[in-house]
């Protein structure tokens, strides 16, 4: 069967469906969680919802085969399988790999190091969020975009404050944290 990938944010309502139309006049349709845990089965004009962690928060649309899941959580991460038993006795299968991610929290910017080096100001900042697999991007007056949780830069003497923004993102959300630096090698945060 075909495999489709889906990434959604935790707490949202999700529709698992296939991009093609169902076989005509199919006999039975089943949705599985992790290949062997039946969630729901349709046949003879009725849907049967089985005892599972999804009971009460799933609904099947027999027309399209779509499975609606409300309030998905990270524990719902899995490969979901839709199996259709056709009128001719053949089975067809579709797989959807669902990844549920929490929205990223607002990052905290920590000053790891700040010191005068030959009249310049050496600055080392880290962008911290608790145990998440995320992407980091620093923005500000930088020679190039930095995609790392740590920013290291050396500033020449200047009169104005400079701000650096760390953006943390995963495939479902992003949040920013900003650090503003004023000479002489001292800081204020916003």
């Amino acid at each position: 069967g075909r495999l489709v990938h889906m990434t959604v944010v935790s707490g949202s309502n999700v529709t698992l469906n296939i991009s093609e139309s169902l076989p005509e006049n199919y006999k039975q349709l089943t949705w599985f969680y992790t290949f062997d845990q039946k969630i729901v089965e349709w046949d003879s004009g009725k849907s049967k919802y089985f005892e599972s962690k999804f009971k009460g928060r799933v609904r099947l649309d027999p027309q399209s085969g779509a499975l609606y899941i409300s309030k998905v959580q990270k524990e719902d991460n899995s490969t979901y399988v839709m199996r259709v038993l056709k009128k001719d006795g053949y089975e067809q299968e579709w797989k959807i790999k669902l990844q549920v991610l929490d929205p990223v929290p607002k990052p905290v910017i920590k000053i790891e190091k700040r010191e005068d080096v030959d009249d310049n100001c050496y600055l080392k900042l880290s962008c911290v969020i608790p145990g998440e697999s995320v992407n980091y991007t620093w923005y500000g007056e930088l020679p190039k975009e930095i995609q790392n949780s740590v920013l290291e830069t050396t500033l020449k003497p200047h009169k104005h404050s400079r701000c650096y923004t760390c953006q943390v993102s995963n495939s479902v959300s992003s949040k920013n944290g900003t650090f503003c630096f004023s000479p002489p090698c001292t800081a204020a945060r916003s």
């Epitope: 039946k38 046949d43 089985f50 038993l85 006795g89 053949y90 089975e91």
Partner: antibody
Framework: QVQLVQSGAEVKKPGAAVKVSCKAS????????ISWVRQAPGQGLEWMGW????????NNAQKFQGRVTMTTDTSSSTAYMELRSLGSDDTAVYYC??????????????WGQGTLVTVSS | DIQMTQSPSSVSASVGDRVTITCRAS??????LAWSQQKPGKAPKALIY???SLQSGVPSRFSGSGSGTDFTLTISSLQPEDFATYYC?????????FGQGTKLEIK
């Protein structure tokens, strides 16, 4: 892993009844149907009937109509097959088999180990 | 009732051989056919359903084909553990019926 464990061998007198059990484990019992199949000594396989563990719906082979009763107990994940008015030609090994669907598709994916029922006076 | 007829009723073959068993239905059953394997004193084991779909865990040397009334089970390269009796079964309509079995013996 999926297992269907059947009750032990039985010896019955002609005219008596026998009740064979099939205890399921390793899956959600109500999500699949159970068929009963028997095999007389040295003979082939004969389908007796099917029951939905979801709602108790049944379909029996005409040959056994009125003589067989299939039931399930969802609290213990057990299917039962009772055969009445036993005759010597009912001597056979009785198997339960899990259907791939909760309604009958006729495709069996797991079988119990079998229960030998001997009918003898 | 739909009659299922298997041929041959027994066949002798050697390890490594390719073996084909055929099954004929008395009426069109589309692809509603299953194959099972049974060893002496043991329960049947599901091999193939929907005429050609392999049950989970069944070695790929087993394959099924056909539709309508004529079906075949092929074992591409016989292994010692394949010597057993094979049954076809129609799942098209109640009552489900089985073929009489084909006994595969060591030559």
């Amino acid at each position: 892993q999926v297992q269907l464990v059947q009750s032990g061998a039985e010896v019955k007198k002609p005219g008596a009844a026998v009740k064979v059990s099939c205890k399921a484990s390793g899956y959600t019992f109500t999500a699949y149907g159970i068929s009963w199949v028997r095999q007389a000594p040295g003979q082939g396989l004969e389908w007796m009937g099917w029951i939905s563990a979801y709602d108790g719906d049944t379909n029996n082979a005409q040959k056994f109509q009125g003589r067989v009763t299939m039931t399930t107990d969802t609290s213990s994940s057990t299917a039962y097959m009772e055969l009445r008015s036993l005759g010597s030609d009912d001597t056979a090994v009785y198997y339960c088999a899990r259907d791939r669907y909760s309604s009958s598709s006729g495709y069996f994916d797991y079988w119990g180990q079998g229960t030998l029922v001997t009918v003898s006076s | 009732d739909i009659q299922m007829t298997q041929s041959p009723s027994s066949v002798s073959a050697s390890v490594g051989d390719r073996v084909t068993i055929t099954c004929r239905a008395s009426q069109d059953i589309s692809s509603w056919l299953a194959w099972s394997q049974q060893k002496p004193g043991k329960a049947p084991k599901a091999l193939i359903y929907a005429a050609s779909s392999l049950q989970s865990g069944v070695p790929s040397r087993f394959s099924g084909s056909g539709s309508g009334t004529d079906f075949t089970l092929t074992i591409s390269s016989l292994q010692p553990e394949d010597f057993a009796t094979y049954y076809c079964q129609q799942a098209n309509s109640f009552p489900y019926t089985f073929g009489q079995g084909t006994k595969l013996e060591i030559k």
